[in-house]
């Protein structure tokens, strides 16, 4: 999901002139996000407002979006940049801890997009930047994986994979280890799926978790809703995570060499979200593509994925 | 014709050791993974072991992991299993046989689809 | 480990006879079961691999069938050659294990 404020906002970056007006009124929402924090306010309500504000008056300058180009990333990393101290400073200033972006949803941030989770000492988590969904299904959602430029490989390694990997705001891995950390609360899941002719579909879990990493980050799912006709994680259910160099799955063969991804391979798959990433013309050729059986078949690579996570509890 | 020729049974006291071969031919036997299996004197089949074809992944029953090993040398066409510590229960014919991989969907089912005569161990003192 | 339970343990019947044979898993296991023949003195002989499917050369009298943790070994019309012991295997998930064994003898 693209975050709502930046539709109109990021196209807008004409002529210096206009740039120049934009970057003062960007400062001066800044300066308002700083006084917020320094009064200690948690209401983003009227922060809201001022981007929506923001938005409206920069849409004058969309007809000069052919020389936007040069200055499309400078704004959107300045915008990217307020949203995050944003989210930073309302953590930091909040009584109540944010976990995840369910936590950031109950104190009013409702826009999609990216944040910054602050460092749990107690838990001995380190900060961590996340993708909000504040839209789908009631909102509060943590992405947890993305696929759909194919930008970016998912043949990784172990390290990675614990770790994490790629461009929160493109393709990319959040991580077993934040995704075990943030499934330590009883959570759900969702998958979103969209095929090369348009259409999209969803499965959800009514629960969701990883095991540590001594357990191999192990798959925990409970009961599956959705449209996309088949539940094709039931096969990977109870099942370890394997990567190229660490073979834990139950087959002779290595389903990570022979899936191009790191995944909880049983022997081999039903679904492998994790696999190349194959574009049109190229998308029904493979066994080790974006594959989920039953909606397509094994050797069709889906167009875009997303998995996403928030708490059972969660009320929109 | 795909053959397997076990070699290396005998008798042996408890404790001892001993490695079993598989001969095989009639196929590329790199491609494949293979297995032993026993059988103990009127019982019934115990699957032992496993190793992929490259030898990479091996698989062991409970009552034999960390006394038995499997390996293979593919320049050989040759299967082992080296038997260390061993039992009076380990007393048994024991089986090669070449494993056939069938893919449906995504999935992959493993076979047991040649077999070898067999070859006797007796563990006694 | 999973267990695989087969029943009958022994079945007496006669030459032309509908045999039926049953394993059945201590957990779902797909289709991921093998049947083999074995005879006295003789190496197991798979018949049927992937719950259903039918080994090249076992003649079509021959047949399986079930899904998860039900399995089941037809010989629709028994032959004198038929008289054998009969073993179910899943390959799962490691350890690999075998049923008891049903023992088919003349009636």
């Known amino acids: 999901q693209k975050p709502h404020k930046r539709k109109t906002q990021l196209k807008a970056a004409g002529c210096c002139e206009e740039m120049r007006e934009l970057k003062a009124q960007v400062a001066n929402l800044s300066s308002l996000l700083g006084e917020l924090s320094r009064k200690q306010e948690s209401d983003w309500v009227s922060v809201v407002m001022q981007v929506m504000e923001l938005e409206s008056s920069s849409k004058h300058m969309e007809s000069r979006l052919s020389t936007a180009e040069s200055k499309y990333s400078e704004m959107n990393n300045q915008i990217d940049i307020m949203q995050l101290q944003a989210a930073q400073t309302v953590t930091q200033t909040s009584a109540d801890a944010i976990y995840d972006c369910s936590s950031l949803y109950q104190k009013n941030y409702r826009i999609s997009g990216v944040y910054k989770l602050p460092p749990d000492e107690f838990l001995g988590s380190p900060e961590l930047e996340v993708f909000c969904d504040m839209e789908t299904s009631g909102g509060g959602w943590t992405i947890i994986q993305r696929r759909k430029s194919g930008l970016v490989s998912f043949y990784q390694d172990w390290r990675q994979y614990k770790q994490g990997f790629g461009s929160i705001r493109g393709d990319f891995w959040l991580g077993n280890e934040h995704i075990h950390r943030l499934t330590r609360q009883p959570s759900r899941l969702r998958v979103e799926l969209e095929d090369w002719e348009g259409n999209a579909r969803y499965a959800e879990y009514s629960y969701f978790a990883l095991g540590n990493e001594l357990n191999s980050y192990r798959l925990f799912l409970g009961n599956y809703s959705g449209n996309v006709g088949k539940d094709a994680l039931l096969y990977h259910n109870n099942t370890v995570f394997s990567t190229k160099d660490k073979d834990n799955d139950n087959c002779l063969d290595k389903c990570a060499q022979l899936r191009k991804g790191g995944y909880w391979y049983n022997c081999c798959t039903d679904s492998n979200l994790n696999g190349v990433y194959y574009r049109l013309g190229e998308h029904r050729k493979h066994m080790d593509g974006i594959s989920w059986y039953g909606w397509h078949g094994a050797n069709y690579s889906l167009k875009r994925v997303e998995m996403k996570i928030r708490p059972e509890a969660f009320k929109p | 014709e795909v053959q397997l020729v076990e070699s290396g049974g005998g008798l042996v006291q408890p404790g001892g050791s001993l490695r079993l071969s598989c001969a095989a031919s009639?196929?590329?036997?790199?491609?494949?993974?293979m297995s032993w299996v026993r059988q103990a004197p009127g019982k019934g089949l115990e699957w032992v072991s496993a190793?992929?074809?490259?030898?990479?992944?091996?698989y062991y029953a409970d009552s034999v992991k960390g006394r038995f090993t499997i390996s293979r040398d593919n320049s050989k066409n040759t299967l082992y299993l080296q038997m260390n510590s061993l039992r009076a229960e380990d007393t048994a014919v024991y089986y090669c046989?070449?494993?056939?991989?069938?893919?449906?969907?995504?999935?992959?089912?493993?076979?047991?689809?040649?077999w070898g005569k067999g070859t006797t161990v007796t563990v006694s003192s | 480990d999973i267990q695989m339970t087969q029943s009958p343990s022994s079945v007496s019947a006669s030459v032309g006879d509908r045999v039926t044979i049953t394993c059945r898993a201590s957990?779902?296991?797909?289709?991921?079961l093998a049947w083999y023949q074995q005879k006295p003195g003789k190496a197991p002989k798979l018949l049927i691999y992937?719950?259903?499917s039918l080994q090249s050369g076992v003649p079509s009298r021959f047949s399986g069938s079930g899904s998860g943790t039900d399995f089941t070994l037809t010989i629709s019309s028994l032959q004198p050659e038929d008289f054998a012991t009969y073993y179910c295997q899943q390959a799962n998930s490691f350890p690999w294990t075998f049923g008891q064994g049903t023992k088919v003898d003349i009636k």
């Open positions: 992937a719950a259903s």
């Open positions: 957990q779902g296991i797909s289709s991921w």
């Open positions: 190793i992929s074809g490259s030898g990479g992944s091996t």
């Open positions: 046989a070449k494993v056939e991989r069938d893919m449906v969907r995504g999935h992959y089912y493993y076979y047991m689809d040649v």
């Open positions: 009639g196929f590329t036997f790199s491609s494949y993974a």
